[in-house]
């Protein structure tokens, strides 16, 4: 229904707290360099204005679109050009071009310092003093570093943060209560960020149809008892929600997501038997819970689908009559029978099926032609299954750190032109797949591994797009989203690469490394490993292991030495010489 005042409508639907949180996220995602105080001031102004519109929907400017209202606010910020450069040019445009322009200027890798967590005592003090401001800072800091973070989910993580602080700040040992719990939230939020960025990439690059196909596959796996009409309805609604969030329409997105959760809870009988626990929760927890609800029990007996999609003489007629509906049905029927496949694999299979029908339905004897499609699915299914087996075996043998190093070597060889920090970040993230997925039951491994890897590789592509340096990466990132992971997996050593000169300073370390937290130490060592591979791309695993073991031994010795500085300055050059010899 049309509302006289959009802003009043959203304020009423969402309530003041969520309204303010979402406006803060929106501003922080658009203008990533502004301070919290600058954004908080704008949020308060927008909220005060919304309240005037709630009181009188006919008041001045209350009929304006949210994009117009928010865009005008952003464009009124002083020193916009000095701080944001060409983003200020967006303000010369009219809506909807102005919003599109803001979206194009979102930076996936803003040059902001890492978000450091304060000491437990300091955190608890500022939380107790002003919980609202404290949580506002959290929303601001996360949103500006992750400009596509799924806004209603960020509100959920802020709520988790709030609950943890409320609980732990009342304990004697605040630190040991807070650290593991906040680490857990941080890990989940980072995964949520890359997954959502993947969805927005899908939407931006390939449009709503591509996202809806993803949603049909995912929902069919989770709700195998729901019929095709129900799955289609859910996929359509979910596509709208994600389109809004990816497009910066965060109030509409959160409101529509709440509506979708309400619909699902009111229609459990036709969707899934597993929703009740989620539906008993308050809004943010409910929507989060529904988004990761366990798969419903599959119907005891589902028939084979060959009769409808391979053996039927009328396949081409059915396909021609309504291509998207026929392919959607294929994807639905295949996905509900295969919760053990990744969404990416299911979409590749549907794509192969579509290509087969396009080819065969133009031939003299279509059934004879499309009758062979099942054999063509075999390599598509076996490739990711082998990937999972090989990589999980390697992870079990090496552990997370060793597995990350193996991936780092592999990816540095595939794309040595990529900057070392990007390679290290990618390898560390890709390596976490082992811990995240390889310990799961067999039938959950493939979807976990492949869909997680795809999301991480999407980030690699986004960073590479900014400064393209590797033809290998460009090739894999240019294709369709579902083909990326197989493309990266198939890459071999880049033969066009001219090895980097050996620079001793790259491998020179100082005693300050000894006091670094374990994670930072690992990053330093992994940076050195990537640089070694860039110097010797064809070094064997054995050679690299020798050098890295020597390096670890050197650090261990010097960090235990009474005079660390002397040890580093005398032993360091010897290490460099040994490294050069080992790789010669």
């Amino acid at each position: 229904e049309a509302h006289k005042s959009e802003i009043a409508h959203r304020y009423n639907d969402l309530g003041e707290q969520h309204f303010k949180g979402l406006v803060l996220i929106a501003f922080s995602q658009y203008l990533q360099k502004c301070s919290y105080d600058e954004h908080a001031k704008l949020v308060q102004e927008v909220t005060d204005f919304a309240k005037t519109c709630v009181a009188d929907e006919s008041a001045a400017n209350c009929d304006k679109s949210l994009h117009t209202l928010f865009g005008d606010k952003l464009c009124a910020i002083p020193n916009l050009r000095e701080n944001y450069g060409e983003l200020a040019d967006c303000c010369t445009k009219q809506e909807p071009e102005r919003n599109e322009c803001f979206l194009q200027h979102k930076d996936d890798n803003p040059s902001l310092p890492p978000f450091e967590r304060p000491e437990a005592e300091a955190m608890c003090t500022s939380f107790k003093e002003n919980p609202t401001t404290f949580m506002g800072h959290y929303l601001h800091e996360v949103a500006r570093r992750h400009p596509y973070f799924y806004a209603p989910e960020l509100l959920y993580y802020a709520e988790q943060y709030n609950e943890i602080l409320t609980q732990c700040c009342a304990e004697a040992d605040k630190e040991s209560c807070l650290t593991p719990k906040l680490d857990g939230v941080k890990e989940k939020a980072l995964v949520s960020s890359v997954r959502q960025r993947m969805k927005c990439s899908s939407m931006q690059k390939f449009g709503e149809r591509a996202f809806k196909a993803w949603a049909v596959a995912r929902l069919s796996q989770t709700f195998p008892n729901a019929d095709f009409a129900e799955i289609t309805k859910l996929a359509t609604d979910l596509t709208k929600v994600n389109k809004e969030c990816c497009h910066g329409d965060l109030l509409e997105c959160a409101d529509d997501r709440a509506e979708l959760a309400k619909y699902m809870c009111e229609n459990q009988a036709t969707i899934s038997s597993k929703l009740q626990t989620c539906c008993d929760k308050p809004l943010l927890k409910k929507a989060h819970c529904l988004s990761e609800v366990e798969h419903d029990t599959m119907p005891a007996d589902l028939p084979a689908i060959a009769a409808d999609f391979v053996e039927d003489q009328e396949v081409c007629k059915n396909y021609a009559e309504a291509k998207d509906v026929f392919l959607g049905t294929f994807l639905y029927e295949y996905s509900r029978r295969h919760p053990d496949y990744s969404v990416s694999l299911l979409l590749r299979l549907a794509k192969k099926y579509e290509a087969t029908l396009e080819k065969c339905c133009a031939e003299a004897n279509p059934p004879a032609c499309y009758g062979t499609v099942l054999a063509e699915f075999q390599p598509l299914v076996e490739e990711p299954k082998n990937l999972v087996k090989t990589n999980c075996d390697l992870y079990e043998k090496l552990g997370e750190y060793g597995f990350q190093n193996a991936i780092l070597v592999r990816y540095t060889q595939k794309a040595p032109q990529v900057s070392t920090p990007t390679l290290v970040e990618a390898a560390r993230n890709l390596g976490r797949v082992g811990t995240k997925c390889c310990t799961l039951p067999e039938d959950q491994r493939l979807p976990c591994v492949e869909d997680y890897l795809s999301a991480i590789l999407n980030r690699v592509c986004l960073l590479h797009e900014k400064t393209p340096v590797s033809e290998h990466v460009t090739k894999c990132c240019s294709g369709s989203l579902v083909e990326r992971r197989p493309c990266f997996s198939a890459l071999t050593v880049d033969e066009t690469y001219v090895p980097k000169e050996f620079k001793a300073e790259t491998f020179t370390f100082h005693s300050d490394i000894c006091t670094l937290p374990e994670k930072e130490k690992q990053i330093k060592k992994q940076t050195a490993l990537a640089e070694l591979v860039k110097h010797k791309p064809k070094a064997t695993a054995e050679q690299l292991k020798t050098v890295m073991d020597d390096f670890a031994q050197f650090l261990d010795t010097c960090c235990k030495a009474a005079d660390k500085d002397t040890c580093f300055s005398t032993e360091g050059p010897n290490l460099v010489t040994r490294c050069k010899d080992a790789l010669a």
């Epitope: 005891a300 007996d301 589902l302 028939p303 689908i305 029927e333 295949y334 295969h338 699915f377 039938d443």
Partner: nanobody, 124 residues
């Protein structure tokens, strides 16, 4: 983990019958689609028959339709293949397979567990 052991193979004259059994251990089979495949000397492995989890659906290769019958007894954790009107071209090593999830029933890549096989020879 599911371990599958086939039995019931042997030498039989053309037109004769055999009943193959596939006994599972390590897990119940009620959550698995069960299938039979065969490999004749010098040939690729081919699909023979499959049955859905609770036995409501059965599927057969064209070459065995009307002659072979697949069945299962979940309480005994066993699947069966009754083979009648056997022909020399049915000579092969017969494998039992179990797959947790299946869209096609006839594709070997949908089966997770395999037995070692039992030899059937049809000869006069």
């Amino acid at each position: 983990e599911v371990q599958l052991v086939e039995s019931g193979g042997g030498v039989v004259q053309p037109g004769g019958s055999l009943r193959l059994s596939c006994a599972a251990s390590g897990s119940t089979i009620s959550s698995y689609v069960m299938g039979w495949f065969r490999r004749a000397p010098g040939k690729e492995r081919e699909f023979v028959a499959a049955i859905s989890r609770s036995g409501g659906y059965t599927y057969y290769a064209d070459s065995v339709k009307g002659r072979f019958t697949i069945s299962r007894d979940n309480s005994k954790k066993t699947a069966y293949l009754q083979m009648n009107s056997l022909r020399p071209e049915d000579t092969a090593l017969y494998y039992c397979a179990a797959g947790r999830y299946s869209a096609w029933y006839s594709q070997s890549y949908e089966y997770d567990y395999w037995g070692q096989g039992t030899l059937v020879t049809v000869s006069s």
